[in-house]
């Protein structure tokens, strides 16, 4: 999906008012310095691409993030503010239903959510120069 035509300010507002705290709660008990940010993004569409990938695509050691509250809210926000997003995701969801995983919090998942927090922070500050 091409995130170029999303309403970025509305997504930012959704993140600040309904998503960010759930990421913090997921990470509770973890030191903010525990994980290094290794995933970066260069502009808002790119940030959303990376956010979508880290949130919804199962990875080795962390297969269950897509079932977390912050993931559901992300999915809902993208569906509303990214034209055509919901249509492109319907087929993907049917495939995902067949391999539904139970929610497990592993160290790998914590690292992944830490990366997500970094991506969202970057998304919210698009005018900052890339480090």
């Amino acid at each position: 999906y091409d995130f170029t035509n999303c309403d970025f300010e509305k997504i930012k507002a959704a993140y600040l008012s309904t998503i960010s705290k759930d990421l913090i709660t997921y990470m509770s008990g973890t030191k903010s310095t525990e994980f290094n940010n290794t995933v970066s993004c260069s502009n808002r569409p790119h940030c959303l691409t990376e956010i979508q990938s880290l949130t919804f695509n199962p990875t080795a050691g962390c297969a269950s993030l897509a079932k977390e509250m912050f993931a559901m809210k992300t999915k809902a926000a993208l569906a509303i503010w990214c034209p055509g997003y919901s249509e492109t995701q319907i087929n993907a969801t049917q495939a995902m239903k067949k391999r539904r995983k139970r929610k497990v919090t592993t160290n790998k998942c914590l690292e992944q959510v830490s990366q997500l927090q970094g991506l969202w922070r970057r998304f919210n500050r698009p005018l900052l120069k890339q480090q």
Epitope: T18, K21, A77, A79, I80, Y85, E87, Q89, T93
Partner: antibody, heavy 116, light 108 residues
Framework: QVQLVESGGLVQPGGSLRLSCAAS????????MSWVRQAPGKGLEWVSG???????YYADSVKGRFTISRDNSKNTLYLQMNSLRAEDTAVYYC???????????WGQGTLVTVSS | DIELTQPPSVSVAPGQTARISCGGD??????VYWYQQKPGQAPVLVIY???KRPSGIPERFSGSNSGNTATLTISGTQAEDEADYYC???????????FGGGTKLTVL
């Protein structure tokens, strides 16, 4: 303007009923939609919700008896209610659940009475 | 699912400040929403994301949330604010929406 209009009715205990909710004024197919009920003189109780892609969630009190569905081409939300009990008597609200976690638009509500 | 606890009733004199509490385990780690419901009407969202007001909601409505308690504050309460108020959050395990039992606000 944004509008949700429900239809309901009277049914006997053990019977079935399907509620409908016609949505207008917004891109229905993009939104997570839900049903909330309110028994006479009681508080609000969330019943069920459904994503644009058909992913569903249910309150424990209705799991296995109620089925939520939607027809995005008709901008309509449904609630199929089976094995109805007297305690299911309530006003049922169709609701647009913003960002999966709160309700920003409510229908006017429809009274479902389960009585013999 | 988590349980949200509200006082059944709160009374306030016109022009005074009304505070309605909503208690729940680690509630500060989740977002809280508040709805106003007048007799025979559907609920109306008055606070979202703990403390934000939807457009059209008067400035006298405000919200806060920390620890195990969220609070809806109505400053300079008016007669028209008399209604039932419900807090709402969600369960992080089931992902279901959860409502408090509701508080009847009486403006004396």
């Amino acid at each position: 303007q944004v509008q949700l209009v429900e239809s309901g009715g009277l049914v006997q205990p053990g019977g079935s009923l399907r509620l409908s909710c016609a949505a207008s004024g917004f891109t229905f197919s993009s939104y997570y939609m839900s049903w909330v009920r309110q028994a006479p003189g009681k508080g609000l109780e969330w019943v069920s919700g459904i994503f644009f892609d058909g992913t569903t969630y249910y309150a424990d009190s209705v799991k296995g008896r109620f089925t939520i569905s939607r027809d995005n081409s008709k901008n309509t939300l449904y609630l199929q209610m089976n094995s109805l009990r007297a305690e299911d008597t309530a006003v049922y609200y169709c609701a647009r659940q913003q960002y999966f976690d709160h309700i920003d638009i409510w229908g006017q509500g429809t009274l479902v009475t389960v009585s013999s | 699912d988590i349980e949200l606890t509200q006082p059944p009733s709160v009374s306030v004199a016109p022009g005074q400040t009304a505070r309605i509490s909503c208690g729940g385990d680690s509630l500060g780690g989740k977002y809280v929403y508040w709805y106003q419901q007048k007799p025979g009407q559907a609920p109306v969202l008055v606070i979202y994301g703990d403390s934000k007001r939807p457009s059209g909601i008067p400035e006298r409505f405000s919200g806060s949330n920390s620890g195990n308690t969220a609070t809806l504050t109505i400053s300079g309460t008016q007669a028209e604010d008399e209604a039932d108020y419900y807090c709402q959050s969600y369960d992080l395990k089931s992902l279901n929406v959860v409502f408090g039992g509701g508080t009847k606000l009486t403006v004396l």
